[in-house]
């Protein structure tokens, strides 16, 4: 019994005069805007996006919207076309949804915010945006009260008219419409494809948060690792940073390239490499390989407990007003607009701490 290193877990609620607001990362579920896909993009990435077959032809499809098909047929006429250099990172950056077009309104603690308050970040969903990233010398925002008026409220247009037509199943095309959101500490990068939650158009979604500070014990009392980050890419250790680090190594090893959201200096994967290697290899790693990316728990971490609720937007009463305000049809408003409210439930944080049962 002397050699048993027991621990107990202490739970505490700590009142705070202010709390650091978390980073909020959001991604449109559509990776590339239809209007931004050029002839050259289509030539290089058309097969990856299931818009072309392997003979550079539009597949025989009965599912196509006539207007979109007409535009694509024109772009897919490659007679006498001379392909130009193509880079997936540049394609994601240029063709991804622009926060300046999506963001219809923004308020933090009642004060107006804007697209300038969102920092571009690349994830597996492509071009995404983080509010309150705490990077580029910007201070981390604080909140002094709980409740909806003391957090972030944004209204977004998800721009479904810009969604790529889906004529096949690929990792780069989505069956869904909406955004993915992750609420995370500024000390860890987003891992939104695995850890994000979905927010649908046609709804106002309320996310009530509670900050949780977790303190784990190292061996032999617990299993945490008081690691300093052994990484070329991230300053501080987190499970997320470790997993991104590991996924990057796995892809470079298997495919000799990296996806656009991965750090490092390996070349970006070409569309062909995405299709034949990077996408299936990463899917295999995430879904099947239980051993390659074993990331240890840090001894200190901050996470955010969340409770979600939703109401319909627009109401029948407001549909006409919103359509007029944003110069769109009522149908467009119903299919594209969402409101997201993120706030602290109360101004306290929870500590969950492992303590040695006896010294």
């Amino acid at each position: 019994y002397y050699f048993c290193y027991h621990h107990v877990t202490k739970l505490d609620e700590v009142a705070a005069s202010q709390l650091t607001f978390p980073a909020v990362t959001l991604c449109n579920l559509n990776e590339f805007r239809f209007s931004q896909v050029s002839k050259n993009d289509l030539y290089h990435a058309g097969e990856l996006l299931a818009l072309l077959n392997n003979r550079y032809e539009i597949p025989d499809t009965q599912m196509a919207d006539e207007k979109q098909l007409e535009i694509l047929q024109d772009k897919a006429n490659f007679r006498s076309f001379k392909p130009k250099p193509f880079n997936m990172r540049e394609f994601y950056d240029r063709a991804g949804h622009d926060i300046r077009d999506m963001l219809l309104s923004c308020h933090f603690r009642g004060e107006a915010c804007s697209a300038e308050d969102f920092k571009v970040v690349f994830t597996r969903y492509g071009k995404c945006y983080t509010f309150n990233s705490g990077q580029d010398g910007r201070p981390r925002l604080k909140t002094m009260k709980g409740g909806t008026g003391n957090g972030l409220e944004i209204m977004l247009d998800i721009q479904q008219d810009e969604y790529l037509p889906v004529w096949g199943e690929t990792d780069e095309t989505s069956f869904e419409a909406g955004i993915k959101v992750q609420i995370h500490s500024q000390d860890e990068p987003p891992f939104i494809d695995q850890l994000g939650f979905g927010v649908a158009p046609g709804f106002q979604t309320f996310v009530s948060c509670q900050e949780q500070r977790l303190i784990y014990l190292p061996s032999p009392w617990g299993t945490c690792n008081a690691v300093t980050m052994d990484s070329d890419f991230f300053d501080s250790y987190s499970i997320t940073a470790c997993r991104i680090d590991c996924e990057t190594r796995y892809l470079v090893e298997n495919c000799n390239c990296r996806m656009v959201h991965m750090p490092g200096d390996a070349p970006y994967c070409t569309p062909e490499q995405y299709k034949e290697c990077a996408d299936p290899a990463l899917d295999f790693l995430v879904e099947k390989d239980q051993e390659y990316c074993v990331c240890e728990m840090p001894c200190n971490l901050t996470r955010y407990g969340k409770e979600l609720s939703m109401v319909k937007i627009p109401s029948k009463a407001s549909a006409k007003y919103l359509a007029k305000k944003f110069n769109k049809s009522e149908q467009y408003i119903g299919e594209n607009i969402l409101v997201l409210d993120i706030f602290f439930e109360v101004l306290n944080y929870e500590t969950i701490e492992q303590k040695k049962a006896y010294e």
Epitope: Y250, E253, N254, F284, K288, E291
Partner: antibody
Framework: EVQLLESGGGLVQPGGSLRLSCAAS????????MSWVRQAPGKGLEWVSG????????HYADSVKGRFTISRDNSKNMVYLQMNSLRAEDTAAYYC?????????WGQGTLVTVSS | DIQMTQSPSTLSASVGDRVIITCRAS??????LAWYQQKPGKAPNLLIY???ILESGVPSRFSGSGSGTEFTLTISSLQPDDFATYYC?????????FGQGTKLEIK
């Protein structure tokens, strides 16, 4: 270039033992699970056994459970299949394969014949 | 264990024909399915992985589709070199299993 080379096959009597080896090169061996697959003469392909990258996890087809043992030596980039209590129905070409998003390439195999 | 049922077992066809081989899994296997071609005395040769991705160097007349439990291998226009035995394999979960094979013969 990824390469796998099987060896150790041969003629053995029923009830006898044999140890197959697979030498791997061209990839970070310890990062990948490995499997053995066999094919009896004129028959189809049958998965036999698999082992995780660290060697900590092993899996077997029901037909060989309790008789075959898979192991690996990551320092030598080798995977092994120890076959005991061999039966006539174990006669086959044995291939080793790297488990990943695609199982490619395969070695040329090593032939095991169990006969008295 | 997941059973893989391949059909037909034997298929007679002529050069230029369009050929479809199907593979049905007894449980959902997502898209973790591969197709192999094998010729007598040779090791299996990978054609398609993750249900629909064409292995590098494999002619584009081969294509794969399906997800979940139903999968197909299509050869759009049969060539003399394509007469061989074809196997599907699920690598979604242990025990990894193969279909019983489809022997493609000259009619």
């Amino acid at each position: 270039e990824v390469q796998l080379l099987e060896s150790g096959g041969g003629l053995v009597q029923p009830g006898g033992s044999l140890r197959l080896s697979c030498a791997a090169s061209g990839f970070t061996f310890s990062s990948f699970a490995m499997s053995w697959v066999r094919q009896a003469p004129g028959k189809g392909l049958e998965w036999v056994s698999g082992i995780s990258g660290s060697g900590g996890g092993t899996h077997y087809a029901d037909s060989v459970k309790g008789r075959f043992t898979i192991s690996r030596d990551n320092s030598k980039n080798m995977v092994y299949l120890q076959m005991n209590s061999l039966r006539a129905e174990d006669t086959a070409a044995y291939y080793c394969a790297k488990e990943a998003y695609k199982w490619q390439p395969w070695g040329q195999g090593t032939l095991v014949t169990v006969s008295s | 264990d997941i059973q893989m049922t391949q059909s037909p077992s034997t298929l007679s066809a002529s050069v230029g024909d369009r050929v479809i081989i199907t593979c049905r899994a007894s449980q959902r296997i997502s898209s973790w399915l591969a197709w192999y071609q094998q010729k007598p005395g040779k090791a299996p040769n990978l054609l398609i992985y993750k249900a629909s991705i064409l292995e590098s160097g494999v002619p584009s007349r081969f294509s794969g589709s399906g997800s979940g439990t139903e999968f197909t291998l299509t050869i759009s226009s049969l060539q003399p070199d394509d007469f061989a035995t074809y196997y599907c394999q699920q690598y979604n979960s242990y025990s990894y299993t193969f279909g019983q094979g489809t022997k493609l013969e000259i009619k």
